[in-house]
Interface confidence: medium
Amino acid sequence: VPQKPTVSLNPPWNRIFKGENVTLTCNGSNFFEVSSMKWFHNGSLSEVANSSWNIVNADFEDSGEYKCQHQQFDDSEPVHLEVFSDWLLLQASAEVVMEGQPLFLRCHSWRNWDVYKVIYYKDGEALKYWYENHNISITNATVEDSGTYYCTGKLWQLDCESEPLNITVIKAQHDKYWLQ
């Protein structure tokens, strides 16, 4: 069975601000021949032929679907990158999470300016409050953690809020044939 490579992001967020940097890495076993690596952005073949693609000073055109391909393997699953202009941006380790997996949320500010009085909300209800900015960590996500999240905070003297982000936690699929 052909293996699928996977694309990882560093930093690990798929929602970033305009002007930020992110590195996409094509991970897979025994990718010795770097020259046979291919990257696709929104279905178009890129000139990048390395196992990593560095996006520097991200712009809106960098948004979209990224895939990598190695000649001996299937295409990777797509990774979606979204570039925003705003004051606060709610970032998540994943927007679709398997039950039992961890989920991390980060209330990220434009240019990493200091944010105070940070409140995370889920479905309109305040979830957590910190005077200084902190991330939210859910060790074992459950279906009840699904919902619409956003964060608010003070940037300088101004009240700011992020756009909402839908998080879906799905039950782990147990293949009924896996024991056979």
Epitope: F60, S63, E82, Y121, T148, L158, C160, S162, E163, P164
Partner: antibody
Framework: QVQLQESGPGLVKPSETLSLTCTVS????????WIWIRQPPGKGLEWIGY???????NYNPSLKSRVTISVATSKNQFSLKLRSVTAADTAMYYC??????????????WGQGTMVTVSS | DIQMTQSPSSLSASVGDRVTITCRAS??????LNWYQQKPGKAPKLLIY???SLQSGVPSRFSGSGSGTDFTLTISSLQPEDFATYYC??????????FGQGTRLEIK
């Protein structure tokens, strides 16, 4: 300056799909959120939903099951589809721009609106 | 949903009058409150954003105030072109974004 222009049929039959397009001129569709709002005759304003240039959407929960908003960045257009329409969907439909900078979060530019009547 | 309630629903006033329209949110919306003016057959026009900031090109006789749940739009000296319907709108994150029911300002 930036202008928005709605286009689409003015008459739609019940149970069919209402389709409208908003063309943005004088600015790139990037960097903003693009909105659909409607106003039934003699009534107030109702937010239908928005789309970001990258394709992220957010819909009014009361219409979510029937609405799709899409964007064509290369054409500088975004579109509204409202399925299974009834007479209650008869309204003036406006497209608008939402500015997220300077803590505006307001609809600062509007199209002139297009009247859609649902009738057999 | 966050409910926005405007008062009064309609108002008669004369040129030169000082007019105040209020808007109340069913929960705190910080300062995410905007005001629009709509004339018959026209699209709404943004007057005030973020509760108190005047949109570019809008006459200074319009002003906004408030935070949390209670907001006010004031027209310091009514002009003939100000007779219209006014809407408040909250733009807080939880969908849906909602408008007040409108205040119709008529000539006395």
């Amino acid at each position: 300056q930036v202008q928005l222009q709605e286009s689409g049929p003015g008459l739609v039959k019940p149970s069919e799909t209402l389709s409208l397009t908003c063309t943005v001129s004088g600015d790139s569709i990037s960097d903003y959120y693009w909105i659909w709002i409607r106003q039934p005759p003699g009534k107030g304003l109702e937010w239908i939903g928005y789309i970001y240039y990258s394709g992220s959407t957010n819909y009014n929960p009361s219409l979510k099951s029937r609405v799709t908003i899409s964007v064509a960045t290369s054409k500088n257009q975004f579109s509204l589809k409202l399925r299974s329409v009834t007479a209650a969907d008869t309204a003036m439909y406006y497209c608008a721009r939402r500015n997220n900078w300077n803590h505006v979060r307001a609809f600062d530019i509007w199209g002139q609106g297009t009247m859609v009547t649902v009738s057999s | 949903d966050i409910q926005m309630t405007q008062s009064p629903s309609s108002l008669s006033a004369s040129v030169g009058d000082r007019v105040t329209i209020t808007c109340r949110a069913s929960q705190s919306i910080s300062s995410y409150l905007n005001w629009y003016q709509q004339k018959p057959g026209k699209a709404p026009k943004l007057l005030i954003y973020a509760a108190s900031s005047l949109q570019s090109g809008v006459p200074s006789r319009f002003s906004g105030s408030g935070s949390g749940t209670d907001f006010t739009l004031t027209i310091s000296s009514l002009q003939p072109e100000d007779f219209a319907t006014y809407y408040c709108q909250q733009s807080y994150s939880t969908p849906p974004i909602t408008f007040g029911q409108g205040t119709r300002l008529e000539i006395k």
